[in-house]
Each structure stands twice: as C-alpha cells, then as structure tokens.
Interface confidence: medium
C-alpha cells in the first residue's frame, strides 16, 4: 500500500509500481536530443551529453539512437515510453540495464538504437560483439 504521505502529496498518475508492487519512480537519462557525434568504429562510446534529465513519466526508459550517413554521425539521447514505438521501432530491450545497440533497417543510413532502464544508462552505448551477436557480419564491418 502507498503511505498516506505519498498518497496526499503526489499526483495519482505518478504512482506506478513494478510487477512486485514496488514503487517505480522516474528515471534519470541523458537527454540531449540529437547531437553530432564522433562515435565511430568503437566497441562502445560515451554520449558526451552533459544534460541528465528526469524523465517525465515513471514508465519511461532511456533511449539512444546512433545514425550515420554520407555527411555526418549523430547520437540522439532521450527518455521514451517503451509502450510506444520510437522512430517506428518497438523498444524491445527496454528492461535491459545496459544500452546495447542493435541495427535497424533504415534506407540511406546506418541506424542503431538501444534502450535501457537504469539511471543514465544511455550515457554509455555499447556496440560490442560480446553483447550483440545478432549480426556478426555487420560488426566485422564496423570494427575493421
């Protein structure tokens, strides 16, 4: 049950519990939206985002999107509700404590996305083979 103090002082829509009934509270995520990045040909990268933001809703998770085209590389860091698609993709890995990048099919660019549910977990984005074995050929290309 929710203590009387919390019931009185917090909006009801902010009281979210996990499957065990524990209070689920808003996460802290890196939240710089889209920024140019130098992250390329690395097993992992730091976001270099200086903004740590409190997500608006308790159910939101941290998301990072890495995109490379002929002109530039960008890294997007946001909070997002995993029940809703992001960039037309479902956040399949939202429960992960780490942000493990997975490639998504997007015409004209290389597009990786990850989501995770620990504080500031989208600060460190991981492309490494030890976590991502879904497309080993692609990883060979990335790390050559």
């Amino acid at each position: 049950t929710i203590p009387p103090h919390v019931q009185k002082s917090v909006n009801n829509d902010m009281i979210v519990t996990d499957n065990n009934g524990a209070v689920k509270f808003p996460q802290l995520c890196k939240f710089c939206d889209v920024r140019f990045s130098t992250c390329d040909n690395q097993k992992s990268c730091m976001s270099n985002c200086s903004i740590t933001s409190i997500c608006e809703k308790p159910q939101e998770v941290c998301v990072a999107v890495w995109r490379k085209n002929d002109e530039n590389i960008t890294l997007e860091t946001v909070c997002h509700d995993p029940k809703l698609p992001y960039h037309d993709f479902i956040l399949e890995d939202a429960a992960s404590p780490k942000c493990i990048m997975k490639e998504k099919k997007k015409p004209g660019e290389t597009f990786f996305m990850c989501s995770c549910s620990s504080d500031e977990c989208n600060d460190n984005i991981i492309f490494s083979e030890e976590y991502n074995t879904s497309n080993p050929d692609l990883l060979l290309v990335i790390f050559q």
């Epitope: 209070v23 808003p26 740590t52 933001s53 608006e56």
Partner: antibody, heavy 121, light 107 residues
C-alpha cells in the same frame, strides 16, 4: 511521522574532511518511497544541492563539488552520512539532511533542522 | 547547470495584500519547478511542486503557475506568518538548482 536530524562537529579545519550523519526516525531508510539528500546554505546565502541517494543504491552528486562529496547509507542504524573532503572556508554553511518522495525526484518535502559547520583553523 | 533568477529580490507589502513572486529559468524546466518558504533560523518548507501542486498542509492562499522558463508564486492575501524568504527550485535536470531567493518583508 518520518523525520530526519543532522549531527556532527560544528568546526572543521581547512583541508580536513567534514563528516555529518543524518538519523532517520519514524520509518525505514530502506523505504522505496523516499530518497535522501544533503543540501547546504552558506550564511546569508541561497541553497545548494550537494547530492542524493536513491532507492536501489544510486547516488548523485553536484558536479560543482568536484568529487569531494561522498554520501553513504547505513541501513542497520537507519542513518545516512555525508563526507566532504579538502574543505575550505567556502564550505562554511548550514548543512541540511532531507527526504523526498521518490516519485517526484528532486523535490524535498522534509528537512532536518540544519547544522552549522564552520571551516576555520 | 540551470540558473534560476528570482525577482524582485525584496518585496515590501502589508498584511492582506497580494504578493507575486517571479522565477525565470535559463532554459526550459518543463513544469518541474518547486517553491519553498524559509523563515530565519529555520529549514525551508515545501509549498508548491511541479509548478502548481500544493504540498500537504499548505493553505490555499499559496498558488503557483507557469511552465517552460517563466513561473510565478502568488500569495493571494498575506498573513503575518507569510513574511519570509521564498526560493524556487528546478528538478528538470541534474543537479537540482535553487534561485537566489525573494524576501517578502512587512512594509
């Protein structure tokens, strides 16, 4: 009614480490409903957030303190503590320990009475 | 970090008058702004959180409004116990930061 109260030395010498303890009464410090913070206020000035300990073990600090601050929790004693290393006169302040609801992170709804710490030789 | 600027620094009013305090953020803090009251020798007391929500036990004469970068705390009719320093505080980005305070004094 859950309450917090600070304790510790009122005088610390420059370059030494300031150590304060906050005792939580009327409830468990392990509750998932609350986070625990330290905030300070130099005499006649405004408030500065030092850091917070959130349920699940994550601790956040104000980057302005340049890694000098350490917040730790002792669940067996229902206490949490602050250590601030390499203090200078600029660290002279009233130090408050405080509690906030985890569902509205970053808001303080219960404060200790505050303890004045003077840094002087 | 986000800088909060409060105005005026001092507000001189009489009991029964309306007080309007302003807080401006250096960048958007969404609706994540709180107001605290502090009397001499005491700890701050939470009045309003998330721009417009009154904390438990706070009288209805205290109200908050605003979003983004501009926020207002209004005390509809000042009571003698309302003369104090008022701080705004954002929780949108880490670290949470406070304004420098507005002193409401008896005219």
């Amino acid at each position: 009614q859950l309450q917090v109260q600070e304790s510790g030395p009122g005088l610390v010498k420059p370059s030494e480490t300031l150590s304060l303890t906050c005792t939580v009464s009327g409830g468990s410090i392990s509750s998932s409903y609350f986070s625990w913070s330290w905030i300070r206020q130099p005499p006649g000035k405004g408030l500065e957030w030092i850091g917070s300990f959130y349920y699940g073990g994550k601790t956040y600090y104000n980057p302005s303190l340049k890694s000098r601050a350490t917040i730790s929790i002792d669940t067996s004693k229902n206490q949490f503590s602050l250590k601030l290393s390499s203090v200078t006169a600029a660290d002279t302040a009233v130090y408050y320990c405080a509690r906030g609801p985890t569902t509205i992170r970053g808001v303080i709804d219960s404060w200790g009475q505050g303890t004045l710490v003077t840094v002087s030789s | 970090e986000i800088v909060l600027t409060q105005s005026p620094a001092t507000l001189s009013l009489s009991p029964g008058e309306r007080a309007t305090l302003s807080c401006r953020a250096s960048q958007s803090v969404r609706s994540y702004l709180a107001w605290y009251q502090q009397k001499p020798g005491q700890a701050p007391r939470l009045l309003i959180y998330d721009a417009s929500n009154r904390a438990t036990g706070i009288p209805a004469r205290f109200s908050g409004s605003g979003s983004g970068t501009d926020f207002t705390l209004t005390i509809s009719s000042l009571e003698p116990e309302d003369f104090a320093v008022y701080y705004c505080q954002q929780r949108s980005n880490w670290p949470p930061t406070f304004g420098q305070g507005t002193k409401v004094e008896i005219k």
